[in-house]
Interface confidence: medium
Amino acid sequence: KSSNEATNITPKHNMKAFLDELKAENIKKFLYNFTQIPHLAGTEQNFQLAKQIQSQWKEFGLDSVELAHYDVLLSYPNKTHPNYISIINEDGNEIFNTSLFEPPPPGYENVSDIVPPFSAFSPQGMPEGDLVYVNYARTEDFFKLERDMKINCSGKIVIARYGKVFRGNKVKNAQLAGAKGVILYSDPADYFAPGVKSYPDGWNLPGGGVQRGNILNLNGAGDPLTPGYPANEYAYRRGIAEAVGLPSIPVHPIGYYDAQKLLEKMGGSAPPDSSWRGSLKVPYNVGPGFTGNFSTQKVKMHIHSTNEVTRIYNVIGTLRGAVEPDRYVILGGHRDSWVFGGIDPQSGAAVVHEIVRSFGTLKKEGWRPRRTILFASWDAEEFGLLGSTEWAEENSRLLQERGVAYINADSSIEGNYTLRVDCTPLMYSLVHNLTKELKSPDEGFEGKSLYESWTKKSPSPEFSGMPRISKLGSGNDFEVFFQRLGIASGRARYTKNWETNKFSGYPLYHSVYETYELVEKFYDPMFKYHLTVAQVRGGMVFELANSIVLPFDCRDYAVVLRKYADKIYSISMKHPQEMKTYSVSFDSLFSAVKNFTEIASKFSERLQDFDKSNPIVLRMMNDQLMFLERAFIDPLGLPDRPFYRHVIYAPSSHNKYAGESFPGIYDALFDIESKVDPSKAWGEVKRQIYVAAFTVQAAAETLSEVA
């Protein structure tokens, strides 16, 4: 068959038919259905939802829908022995206790199985001691405390505000500083947007609201007991002492009512500057310990959570490709939630459901995609991306040979201001072209394209007339596909105005107040932003699965490689004397980037001219495009992070959510002036430049003419 014969209508017509079939009303209905009870990973309720989704995807018309189960390490509070924090007096009497649960939102008072706020994977313990306020507990916050203020956190309980960086990094930093416990809290400065009411009257965080979340430092390992391999029936499991990424000190989250009680008595040093002050009526003193009259009082944590090997269930749906069934385009998002999951994840799951329904409708009318589309409803994302990672570990050989692209589909919204896209540079042109074809849902942009409103509201810092597209970091289910396997990946959602709303994430993130009503009343009453996100995610999947030539532009990788090389070079040049002393040169990297640019340019020219009716040549060119992302994978991984193998991008070592470019070089240079052995440190910089230069050159050569 010629490449178009698989589809009985023209590709343009297909895309339009697919997009036109997506309906806001359906997304709304699916969101309601998915959010009426909690769907915590490892629970019966989430298993039942998996079976419901399996059944509905079959009804929608997918060729097959299977459950893939794994037995992974999860963490739960002890039902009879709740977690809390106390202030104790000199006699050991508890004179204040933090709340045991969040006040339930209106209409949900009688819902059972709402897991109380906890930090998943916290070890048990009842440490007591003086409190130290550590701001956001970022690397730079601990530098400020230890180096500038000479405050020692060893043996102290630290209290840190949520925001800016992944909570697992905060805990890791506290451990390294010698703390014996961590209290995490949501400060109104970060989780209460000015001019907006608290839930249930608005989308702000009430004082009793608390953010749940895992505090692991997995670095891409998946199940802590089976790193690198699937947690199947015959798995060999590590002992808990050898488990990957578990915290070693007790951790617990609280809301700002309770935080006020802990922080208002703080004594010791004043905050170093205004960036350490939040919005509570407290001095934000750093400590250690309480002031004057209260100096004999201590803080005590009571943590009794347990880690348990528990069965989880992914739902994997297949729509077989008509021409290239051995090429996989994957759309995946998680199903498990901390409580109701009104935004995270069900605003994403509802969109995936509607995309599956639309694809199924086309299939029932006789259409098939050119390539196979896999749909996934991942479990246990909230516990460390476990469902997606275990499935990818189980299917790694197929994925590394057949994986074309992965599109992530967690929360569809974190605001309602404009589009936000993070993706591989290979997808930039795909995203630009697609958004030019879609209508903007934004007020004031009626009749204009999504590209236009997005570019106006979120302009690229480098290229005028283009929108900002960010680097992929982690903290979501694309991690294993992109960072470990080197499969081109992307994600899209509607976001807030970062210029005017500086709070971290959205205020009700991972709280009991993340309900259907939150979305329907305050974020997207018409579900028009959800529909737009469905069009973007679905449109990307459609193009990736159906275009004759893969919609990847390797020239965009060349542009960013140059930008990243310039950036890392300028960081290194902050140490000109050492670069001279240790003969540190970036020439090899710049040379490799230059070669990549030239080869990518020639490849793109050939891509315009080759005979697309020749299936062998077409497949050859497409394979070069598909395997380009794979070529950036170093099989040895990054130092101390074997499952982060992408040489161009990795999650930041200081914030899992953020992407870092040339992470090997970046980490080698980080805080290099404080290293005890500068010769060794600069030697590692040189080694990392060598690895990066080699990898870029090797990737370039995959785009050269094959013979």
Epitope: E102, P103, G195, K197, S198, D201, N204, G207
Partner: antibody, heavy 122, light 111 residues
Framework: EVQLQQSGPELVKPGASVKISCKAS????????MNWVKQRPGQGLEWIGR????????NYNGKFKGKATLTADKSSSTAYMQLSSLTSVDSAVYFC???????????????WGQGTSVTVSS | DIVMTQSPASLAVSLGQRATISCRAS??????????MHWYQQKPGQPPKLLIY???NLESGVPARFSGSGSGTDFTLNIHPVEEEDAATYYC?????????FGGGTKLEIK
Amino acid sequence: EVQLQQSGPELVKPGASVKISCKASGYAFSSSWMNWVKQRPGQGLEWIGRIYPADGDTNYNGKFKGKATLTADKSSSTAYMQLSSLTSVDSAVYFCARCGWDGGVYYAMDYWGQGTSVTVSS
Amino acid sequence: DIVMTQSPASLAVSLGQRATISCRASKSVTTSGYSYMHWYQQKPGQPPKLLIYLASNLESGVPARFSGSGSGTDFTLNIHPVEEEDAATYYCQHSRELPRTFGGGTKLEIK
């Protein structure tokens, strides 16, 4: 420092209306509910209602519906209460009071104006 | 509406002794471990001043001799040891639902 400065005393005739003001400073005016409370001489406190300046949302005690009208001007960070069809039972001191962080859904009134005395007399 | 009943209407306490004021709500103002009950102090010619929020939390700047307790419908404000400057009228108020309502007040006199 948070401050609520209320307008001065009013002497008004029965049947007339009066509009008293409460100028806020030292915090984000739009972001907190502003409450109004009545206190008759030698009596207790009565909650009249509240306004959310950011969007003008109001809630009233049923007893004061039609009697009190709450408004707010974000540009001047000032809340207003208009009292209409005044009679002798409306003679009282009226306080404005801000709600703490939680937007007043579950929270207390943490800062109060000094009060405005309204006397209804012919 | 939730009716708040304070008792006693007035009391006289010797300097250094304990003053106990009770407040009963006509229905529970506690949900999920939070009690939406607050206490205020008012001196003649002054606006009320917040002392205790959410039943037991001391407002910053308020002396530690003030404490609050209770849940459900029954709440108590304790002052110990009473000082001269504590002579005032004390009010309880709930914020469980709309409308907000206050207790009738308790006048504290120092003997």
